[in-house]
C-alpha cells in the first residue's frame, strides 16, 4: 500500500533527477551530432552560418562555475524551446528539399520536447518558480531560398549542439553542487 | 589531415609544474572538445578532462582537481594542459585527443608527451 | 566510478581466425537508447585509436572486420578474420557518466 492520503510523496533524489536529465542531453546531442553529420554530406556548406533568430550561446566558462540551478534549467528551457520552434519551421518550410534528412529531424524534434518536459518536470520536483507562460513568438520568416534554407538548418543544428554541451557542462557542474 | 601535435618530453623535479601543448591542425577547432589522457607504465588509461574550446568550461575528474589547468588558445587552435605539485605517479605519457562534444569518447589523438619526475 | 573489466587478459590467435574480446561493465552503460562503449586499438609505442563508439558504430576509415556489440554490462569487440596488423592490445572505455574510465585492456598476440 502507498502512503497514506494526503502525507507528501517522497522527494526523488534531486541528484538522480539530474543524472537522468543530463543523460536524455547527451542522447539529444547525439542525434543532433549525426544530423549533422549528415546534413553536412548532403549538402556541404563551408564557413560559419549564423541566424539572427537563434539564442545567443548561454553562458561563457567563467559564469559557469557561478551558475545556480535555477538559472541553468530557465535558461535552457528558454533556448531549447526556441531551437524547437526552429526545427519545426525547418520541417515545414524545407520540408521538400529535406526529404533526405527524415525520419532524423523527426525523431529529433521528439527527443527535444520529451526533454523540455523532462526540464519543467524536473523544475517542478526541484521546487523551483515555475515560469509564465512564454509570449507567442513571432513567426519566422520563410527561407529566402533552397540554399537559404539549408545554410539556416546549419546554423540551427550547430547552436543545439553547442547549446547541448553548455548544458551537461553546466547541469554536471551543479550536480556536484548538490 | 586532422592531426593534434603535442609538445616535446619533459623531465620535472617533484613539487614542479609542467605545461604540455597540444595543436590542431585540418578541422574546425570550435566543434570539438579537447581531452587529456594519461598513461602511466603498467596502469590503466586515466581521463583527466576536458575543455570545450567556444565556452572554455573545463570539466576535471576528481581525482586531477586542483592540480590539473587545463585551457585553450583559440587563436592558435592550441591546447595546453598544466600539472602542478608534481610527484613520482605523474611519471607518464600524457596525450591529448579530440571528443565528440559531452561524449567522451576520442577519435584523434596527439603522439603523446612523456613527463619524467624524478629528483 | 564504473569499473570495467576486460577479458581475457591476453589471447594468442593465428592470422585468419576469429577474435573475440569482452568488456564487463560494473553497472549498465546503456541508457536513453545509446550505450556508452568504446573500443580502442593501441600498439606499443603509438596513440590508442578508435574503432568502435557507442556500442557499435564503426568508426571512419577502420575495416570492416571490426565489429561491436552488446548493451546494459556486457560488450563485445569481435574481429572476424585477423590480419597480421591486428595483433596489439585492446581497451574499452565508458562515458556513461564522469569520469570516463578504461579497461585493463586485452592483448592480442600472434600464436
Known amino acids: 500500500p502507498g502512503p497514506p492520503p494526503g502525507s507528501p510523496r517522497a522527494s526523488p533524489d534531486p541528484r538522480a533527477e539530474l543524472d537522468s536529465t543530463v543523460l536524455l542531453t547527451r542522447s539529444l546531442l547525439e542525434d543532433t551530432r549525426q544530423l549533422t553529420i549528415q546534413l553536412k554530406d548532403k549538402f556541404p556548406a563551408d564557413g560559419d552560418h549564423n541566424l539572427d533568430s537563434l539564442p545567443t550561446l548561454a553562458m561563457s566558462a567563467g559564469a559557469l562555475g557561478a551558475l545556480q540551478l535555477p538559472s541553468v534549467l530557465t535558461r535552457l528551457r528558454a533556448d531549447l524551446l526556441s531551437y524547437l520552434r526552429h526545427v519545426q519551421w525547418l520541417r515545414r518550410a524545407m520540408g521538400s528539399s529535406l526529404k533526405t534528412l527524415e525520419p532524423e529531424l523527426g525523431t529529433l524534434q521528439t527527443r527535444l520536447d520529451r526533454l523540455l518536459r523532462r526540464l519543467q518536470l524536473l523544475m517542478s520536483r526541484l521546487a523551483l518558480p515555475q515560469l509564465p507562460p512564454d509570449p507567442p513568438a513571432p513567426p519566422l520568416a520563410p527561407p529566402s531560398s533552397t540554399w537559404g534554407g539549408i545554410r539556416a538548418a546549419h546554423a540551427i543544428l550547430g547552436g543545439l549542439h553547442l547549446t547541448l554541451d553548455w548544458a551537461v557542462r553546466g547541469l554536471l557542474l551543479l550536480k556536484t553542487r548538490l | 589531415e586532422v592531426q593534434l601535435v603535442q609538445s616535446g618530453a619533459e623531465v620535472k623535479k617533484p613539487g614542479a609544474s609542467v605545461k604540455i601543448s597540444c595543436k590542431a591542425s585540418g578541422y574546425i577547432f570550435r566543434d570539438y572538445n579537447m581531452d587529456w589522457v594519461k598513461q602511466a607504465p603498467g596502469q590503466r588509461l586515466e581521463w583527466i578532462g576536458d575543455?570545450?574550446?567556444?565556452?572554455?568550461?573545463?570539466i576535471y575528474n576528481q581525482k586531477f582537481t586542483g592540480r590539473a589547468t587545463l585551457t585553450v588558445d583559440k587563436s592558435a587552435s592550441t591546447a595546453y594542459m598544466e600539472l602542478s605539485s608534481l610527484r613520482s605517479e605523474d611519471t607518464a605519457v600524457y596525450y591529448c585527443?579530440?571528443?565528440?562534444?559531452?561524449?567522451?569518447?576520442?577519435?584523434?589523438w596527439g603522439q603523446g608527451t612523456t613527463v619524467t619526475v624524478s629528483s | 566510478d564504473i569499473v570495467l573489466t576486460q577479458s581475457p587478459a591476453s589471447l594468442a590467435l593465428s592470422p585468419g581466425e576469429r577474435a573475440t574480446l569482452s568488456c564487463r561493465a560494473s553497472?549498465?552503460?546503456?541508457?536513453?537508447?545509446?550505450?556508452?562503449i568504446h573500443w580502442y586499438q593501441q600498439k606499443p609505442g603509438q596513440a590508442p585509436r578508435l574503432l568502435i563508439y557507442l556500442a557499435s558504430n564503426l568508426e571512419s576509415g577502420v575495416p570492416a572486420r571490426f565489429s561491436g556489440s552488446g548493451s546494459g554490462t556486457d560488450f563485445t569487440l569481435t574481429i572476424s578474420s585477423l590480419e597480421e596488423e591486428d595483433f596489439a592490445t585492446y581497451y574499452c572505455?565508458?562515458?556513461?557518466?564522469?569520469?570516463?574510465?578504461f579497461g585493463q585492456g586485452t592483448k592480442l598476440e600472434i600464436k
Open positions: 572505455q565508458h562515458s556513461r557518466d564522469l569520469p570516463p574510465t
Open positions: 575543455i570545450n574550446p567556444t565556452i572554455g568550461a573545463p
Open positions: 585527443a579530440r571528443g565528440a562534444l559531452a561524449h567522451w569518447y576520442f577519435d584523434v
Open positions: 553497472k549498465s552503460v546503456s541508457t536513453e537508447g545509446y550505450s556508452y
